[in-house]
């Protein structure tokens, strides 16, 4: 009997996998930069569509007989930031049937990234000789974090982090002082955050 109570699900996800969506030069850019969104299908497609989730109308179509479609956003404005997804379809698919959409790509167009926070772990008062960890926390993943110490011109430490934060370790004897941090996009065109509020580390 072929009438089970649970619905039959076909085909497996690997049958026509979702495409990949990426941005050049970066997903975080300053206004006025030309951005190219690249939608790559796992197989040659016939038509690609770029859209923003929640919007009925697609932003752009590309009719290309290949695995890659490029969507050009010229001199982007902050209003063009937001979530993007892409789909592909082939000419012999049913009317209106598209692939599953790509994962969301978040495009941020801004002059300056939000200010990070800087906190001490376990706290800003340390015992003599004890190490202290400073966490610089922003809102974006895959950023480069920079720690500064007041009175020292050059950055004290750099960290690239896949998380929206980075931890910096200060050796106990040199820990006391006034610190701040910021973060920036890891490659050009660089977008920088505001500096964090200062954090004072002192001995007990």
């Amino acid at each position: 009997d072929i009438t089970p109570s649970v619905a039959i699900i076909v085909p497996p996800a690997s049958y026509h996998p979702k495409p990949w969506l990426g941005a050049q030069p970066a997903t975080v850019v300053t206004p006025g930069v030309n951005v190219t969104l690249r939608c790559r299908a796992p197989q040659p497609a016939w038509r690609f569509g770029l859209f923003k989730p929640g919007e009925i109308a697609p932003l752009l179509f590309r009719d290309v007989s290949s695995e890659l479609a490029e969507f050009f956003l010229e001199e982007v404005t902050p209003a063009q930031g937001g979530s993007y997804r892409c789909c592909y379809r082939r000419p012999d698919w049913g009317p209106g049937v598209w692939s599953q959409p790509s994962d969301v790509l978040e495009l941020l167009v801004t002059e300056e990234l939000p200010r990070p926070s800087l906190v001490a772990l376990p706290g800003p008062v340390v015992g003599p000789g004890a190490n202290v960890s400073l966490r610089c926390a922003g809102r974006l993943r895959n950023m480069s974090f920079v720690l500064y110490r007041e009175g020292v011109a050059a950055p004290l430490q750099y960290r690239h982090s896949a998380q929206p934060w980075a931890d910096f370790t200060l050796l106990g004897a040199r820990a006391p002082g006034t610190y701040s941090c910021y973060y920036h996009t890891p490659s050009a065109p660089y977008v920088l955050s505001q500096r964090s509020e200062v954090l004072v580390i002192s001995w007990e």
Partner: antibody, heavy 117, light 109 residues
Amino acid sequence: EVQLLESGGGLVQPGGSLRLSCAASGFTFSDYYWTWVRQAPGKGLEWVSGSPVFGAANYAQNFQGRFTISRDNSKNTLYLQMNSLRAEDTAVYYCAKAGIPGHFDIWGQGTLVTVSS
Amino acid sequence: QSVLTQPPSASGTPGQRVTISCSGSSSNIGNNYVSWYQQLPGTAPKLLIYGNSNRPSGVPNRFSGSKSGTSASLAISGLRSEDEADYYCQSYDSSSWLFGGGTKLTVLG
């Protein structure tokens, strides 16, 4: 578990209106094409309308102008607004999910619409 | 009148092989895929075959689909009493989804 549950059917007079709903669970609703198919008593299956991931909805010629399909991705729900109903619109209305390359792989249990005075 | 043409009825005895045909044109079956559905009395249709010849998980291999030119066919081998149902073919053109008129399969004896 994947489920489609239609509602909103019932008895309506000729010229009247009805709004059908199809609540989906077990799916990322927004990622798929959803459709309505109907079946008049003792007759075969007839495609009515479809709602793609994005872009304009498509309709069978007989229903363009009278019926409107819509979806609310936040509620995982598909709708069919039926206006100017006629006796010949009496049918069980099914919602279904379209798969690639072009088939309906998940069906609801259907909701009966009766148009009669 | 359906765009896809199926015989209104078919029959066979248990254990037999039965074939149901579906005829279309170059604008639908000829250039696109065909699916088949089984509908038992009082229930929703269930997908049997998609993409001309693929079976969803859970569908016995007694059911097979094929396509040639502008026609398609569903074959059921080793017929069983529970196969008695209506069977529909389905394809599409550039803007519409299309169903055949359906074939009522009777399992005799």
